[in-house]
């Protein structure tokens, strides 16, 4: 297993609809054709595998398990979007990238993106 640098933004604020997007960029030492991306959430004394996708370079990312994530890839960048976030989902979201094929296997883990989620205030009742 060889190490690889992964960069991601330090902080992202989710939209009022509970959507947060960030870029995960990895310094690929070679020409990988198969890449696996996993997003981990670290907070509240728990670690959650939020979503994971394996993709062939140049193809769409396919997330399994009714995933709350969507994403696209462009070169050594992965554009990730996490949906359906609630205030209690605030935490550090870590991007983990694995170059699966061809060998050698490379692993890179980012420092994490702190995603802040604020639940929207309910609309006040209207008399009209």
């Amino acid at each position: 297993c060889k190490a690889m640098h992964v960069a991601q933004p330090a902080v992202v604020l989710a939209s009022s609809r509970g959507i947060a997007s960030f870029v995960c960029e990895y310094a690929s030492p070679g020409k990988a054709t198969e890449v696996r991306v996993t997003v981990l959430r670290q907070a509240d004394s728990q670690v959650t595998e939020v979503c994971a996708a394996t993709y062939m370079m140049g193809n769409e990312l396919t997330f399994l398990d009714d995933s709350i994530c969507t994403g696209t890839s462009s070169g050594n960048q992965v554009n990730l979007t996490i949906q359906g976030l609630r205030a209690m989902d605030t935490g550090l979201y870590i991007c983990k990238v694995e170059l699966m094929y061809p060998p050698p296997y490379y692993l890179g883990i980012g420092n994490g993106t702190q995603i802040y989620v604020i639940d929207p205030e309910p609309c006040p009742d209207s008399d009209f």
Partner: nanobody, 126 residues
Amino acid sequence: EVQLVESGGQLVQAGGSLRLSCAATGHTYNTYPLGWFRQAPGKEREFVAAISPSGTLRAYADSVKGRFTISRDNAKNTVYLQMNNLKPEDTAVYYCARHRSVGWRASHHLSDYDNWGQGTQVTVSS
């Protein structure tokens, strides 16, 4: 309505291993995340681990990560909790629960889960 029945709890020495099972009945079992929680005497019920509908994604409490492994067999409608290197502080009643919503979540909290089992007692002696 989904019913959950836990089994496998017993008295074990510190450093030992146990495997808990949670058998589910109900046709919606495969579409929901399932979780394990525990409650020690005089303490609140706390999150231990959770697993996504197909079993590809997992979540763990920091206190058990690296020691416990959650898995599920959808053909058998069963979720498992493999517990290794048990410690006296792991002593508790362990409960299986079904997530309220279909699909996976970024975090796991007591309020997210319903359809609780009756629990199985795990006692770790030093």
